[in-house]
Structure formats: C-alpha cells, structure tokens
C-alpha cells in the first residue's frame, strides 16, 4: 500500500513539475527590467527564451520573436537546449510511469517489468529536473553577470548634460517557476526510485531457496534467480527477476488588455 502511495505521489509530483517546466520554458518573463530606481515606469521591458516584450504604460504590449538562430548568445541556446531536453525526458518519463503505476493493470505485465519501468521513469524525472534547474541557473548567472556589468556602465561616460539610461534586467517570474518545477520533478523522480525498491524486495531471493530438498547444492547468484538452479521452471505464482520477487496475490488493483505580436 505504501509503495503504491509513494509511486502515485511521485507520479503526481513529477507531473506538476514537468507542467511547471513547460510553463517556465514558454513564459516571457525570464528577465524583467530592474525597477529599483524607478518603480513606476512608462515603458517596461521583459524577455523570455523565445521572444522579448515591451509593455507600455498605455497598456499596449509588443512582443518580438528571436527570428535568428545563429545571432543568439550561446548561453541562451544552451538554456533552451537544457529546458527542451528536460521537457522531452520528463514527457517520456511520464509516459513510462503511467504504464509502471501499480494501480493500473495492463494485460499480463509482470511486476518485475513495472519495477524496471518505475526505476527508468524515476531516473528520467531526476535528469529532467536537473536539466531544468541547470537551465534556469545558467540563465540566472547570465543575468547577474550582465546586471553588474550594466551597473558599472551606468556610472561611466556621463560627461556633459546628456545621460543615457541603460536598461538593467533582473530575475523574472519564469526563473522561480523553473526552479520550483525542476525541484518538484527531481523529488518526484526520487520518490519513483524509492517506490521501485519497494516493488522489488530482495528477501524473496532467499525464500526461493527454501523450497528445495536439503543436501542439494544451490549456487546462489546475488543478481537474482535468472540463472538456472537445475530445478526446472519457476513456481507458477513467482515472478523472479534481477533484484527481487513478488507474488501475484500481493498485487492490488485500484480503479491573458491589448496584446499584439
């Protein structure tokens, strides 16, 4: 029961996390204009991974896509790649984990297969979460570097009457969404891996030995009972695989004001 709960919770947490990673990737507010010196501005700039936007005090918002691929900074391309890899891995992980869920029966799928699939999806979620966290962190680092560079530039070359204001950018909402979503996906993945261990208790390997007559030598292989012991086929209700066994009778079944682009 605890295994099913852990697996189910891991799946739900990962699902929320991946939805968050997708949302963060699509959001335009990865970096937003720093309003420290001017909290109320007539023109507000913010940028995403795919386009940059300007919201005027009039209420009009204009967004322009980055239509160039080669002209974009390598760091931005790297962040895009990390986020997309995170989404793809997460999506595959979700697909795999649906079939791995203990409360869902698919034909005569063995518990060993479910355990393997649970572990696979768990690892995928962990990598997906790490990709998202890495992507967001790289972007945040890029912002911090640029912020201090532009701050230094603000106080240079101000000779005479004319001042040129350089727009500084700070962390946007998407970064926080990305960090939280990546963390949730990571936690979900860990929970799936824990659930996998519960699906495959290792003590079953030892119980399998007790069925045989005394005096008959049995070569125990730590990897499980896939290797033949010379006793023919396995007992009907036992599913033996690398890492443990489980009886079939233990299985429980559970039924967006003016925007223009």
């Amino acid at each position: 029961m605890a295994v099913t709960a852990c697996q189910g919770l891991g799946f739900v947490v990962s699902l929320i996390g991946i939805a968050g990673i997708i949302a963060a990737t699509c959001m335009d507010q990865w970096s937003t204009q720093d309003l420290y010196n001017n909290p109320v501005t007539a023109v507000f700039n913010y940028q995403g991974l795919w386009r940059s936007c300007v919201r005027e005090s009039s209420g009009f918002t204009e967004c322009r896509g980055y239509f160039t691929l080669l002209g974009l900074p390598a760091m931005l391309q790297a962040v895009r790649a990390l986020m997309i890899v995170g989404i793809v891995l997460g999506a595959i992980g979700l697909l795999v984990s649906i079939f791995a869920l203990k409360c869902i029966r698919i034909g005569s799928m063995e518990d060993s297969a479910k355990a393997n699939m649970t572990l696979t999806s768990g690892i995928m979620f962990i990598v997906s979460g790490l990709c998202a966290i890495a992507g967001v962190s790289v972007f945040a680092n890029m912002l911090v570097t640029n912020f201090w560079m532009s701050t230094a530039n603000m106080y240079t070359g101000m000779g005479g009457m004319v001042q040129t204001v350089q727009t500084r950018y700070t962390f946007g909402a998407a970064l926080f969404v990305g960090w939280v979503a990546g963390g949730l996906t990571l936690i979900g993945g860990v929970m799936m891996c824990i659930a996998c261990r519960g699906l495959a208790p290792e003590e079953t390997n030892y119980k399998a030995v007790s069925y045989h007559a005394s005096g008959h030598s049995v070569a125990y292989k730590p990897g499980g009972f896939k290797a033949s012991t010379g006793f023919g086929s396995n007992t009907k209700n036992k599913k033996i695989y690398d890492g443990g066994a489980r009886t079939e009778d233990e299985v429980q079944s559970y039924p967006s004001k003016h925007d223009y682009v």
Partner: antibody, heavy 118, light 113 residues
Framework: QVQLVQSGAEVKKPGASVKVSCKAS????????MNWVRQAPGQGLEWMGN????????SYNQKFKGRVTMTIDKSTSTVYMELSSLRSEDTAVYYC???????????WGQGTTVTVSS | DIVMTQSPDSLAVSLGERATINCKSS????????????LTWYQQKPGQPPKLLIY???TRKSGVPDRFSGSGSGTDFTLTISSLQAEDVAVYYC?????????FGGGTKVEIK
C-alpha cells in the same frame, strides 16, 4: 467615434478643492489609460498623472502628489480628477487625454478652465 | 525628471517652405527592448486641445498629412513640415513618453513669414 467630454468651467477660492470629470465614449473604456494634462494661461503643457480604468491603478506627477486624486466610475465610463489645496498658480485649462501606442495621447477632451481667485 | 528643450521658441516660414523644429532630451528616449524612441509631437492651435501628430519619434498618426515627418534618435529629435500650409500655424510640442513623469518641451510657435 471616440469622444472625451469634460465638465464645465469652475471658479474656486484658494485652499478649496475642484473635481473635474471626463466622460468617455466611442471605445472600450477599460482598454485605455486616461491622463490629465494642464496648461496655465500662455504657458506650456504639464502632465499631472494617469489612471488605468481596468485596474484602477494610478501614476501621479510627484509635483502634485498628495494634492491630486484620480478616480473612475466604470458604470458611466467617467474619469475624475480632484485637485485639493488650490493656489492661484493652479489656474489653468485641465485636459483629459486617452493614452495610445508609444504612450502618446491620441484623443483629448475639450478642456476645463479652472480659475483660482480670492 | 527628463528635461525637454525645444528650439527655436518661434519660427517664421514662408508658405510652401520647409519648417524644422528641434527637440533635445536630457536623457536618451531610446528603449533597448524594442529599439523605439519614446518621443511624441503635438500640434496645438489657439483655443483648442493639442493634436497628436507623431509618436515613436517617426510614426505618423493615421490622418496626419505626410508633409509632417519626425526623425532622430536617443536625445536629439526633429519635426519637419516639408511644405508649410496656412493651417499649420500653431504651437508644436515634443513630449517624453519614456520615463515618468511624462514631460513636455516648452513649445515652438510656427508662423507664416
């Protein structure tokens, strides 16, 4: 067509308050910010502040902060500008103006003359 | 606050001749986000409210005759009336639309010589 109709001329004593109205028609009232600009006799234009009719948020010129209050009545598509603690130098024509692309003012009211005299 | 300085204060031009009005801002009005200059030009005739001519420094409002054109970037801007007509006699104002408080230039009075 877009129309901004302002209330009539006012004569006030120093220290009093004046409330000027601006009724909008011919467009979606909540879709455009409304600004107030004044012009003293023979002088230039001076921006006082604006109000977002959708959220009710305001931005005021620091010069008038504490003296000016902008409000809206969505039911009648009307914007109000109240200026308190009137002084003789507040004698001016007060305009309401709709904000457009580039934060420019594309439509203006006919103006309301406010005279502050003892 | 951004200070807008217009020159000249007044301008007398013959009918059909070119009129040029300059506007200088104390800070750049160029927004890096969309590379647009947040400067607006208005025309005001006696006893009337101002009328929008040009926004984003060079974008003419629909209905405005094409003899009116705006140019410039950053801190220096120009309004040009290519061929002055009698109905163009008015006071012209430039406005900073980039940073609060929104500020206007002192105005340039255009007359017929």
């Amino acid at each position: 067509q877009v129309q901004l109709v302002q209330s009539g001329a006012e004569v006030k004593k120093p220290g009093a308050s004046v409330k000027v109205s601006c009724k909008a028609s011919g467009y979606t009232f909540t879709g455009y910010n409304m600004n107030w600009v004044r012009q003293a006799p023979g002088q230039g234009l001076e921006w006082m502040g604006n109000i977002d009719p959708y959220y009710g948020g305001t931005s005021y010129n620091q010069k008038f902060k504490g003296r000016v209050t902008m409000t809206i009545d969505k039911s009648t598509s009307t914007v109000y500008m109240e200026l308190s603690s009137l002084r003789s130098e507040d004698t001016a024509v007060y305009y309401c103006a709709r904000m457009y692309h580039g934060n420019a003012f594309d439509y203006w009211g006919q103006g309301t003359t406010v005279t502050v005299s003892s | 606050d951004i200070v807008m300085t217009q020159s000249p204060d007044s301008l007398a031009v013959s009918l059909g001749e070119r009129a040029t009005i300059n506007c200088k801002s104390s800070q750049s009005l160029l927004n890096s986000g969309n590379l647009k200059n947040y400067l607006t030009w208005y025309q005001q005739k006696p006893g009337q409210p101002p009328k929008l001519l040009i926004y984003w420094a060079s974008t003419r409002k629909s209905g405005v005759p094409d003899r009116f054109s705006g140019s410039g970037s950053g801190t220096d801007f120009t309004l040009t009336i290519s061929s002055l007509q009698a109905e163009d006699v008015a006071v012209y104002y430039c406005q900073n639309d980039y940073s609060y408080p929104l500020t206007f230039g002192g105005g340039t009075k255009v007359e017929i010589k």
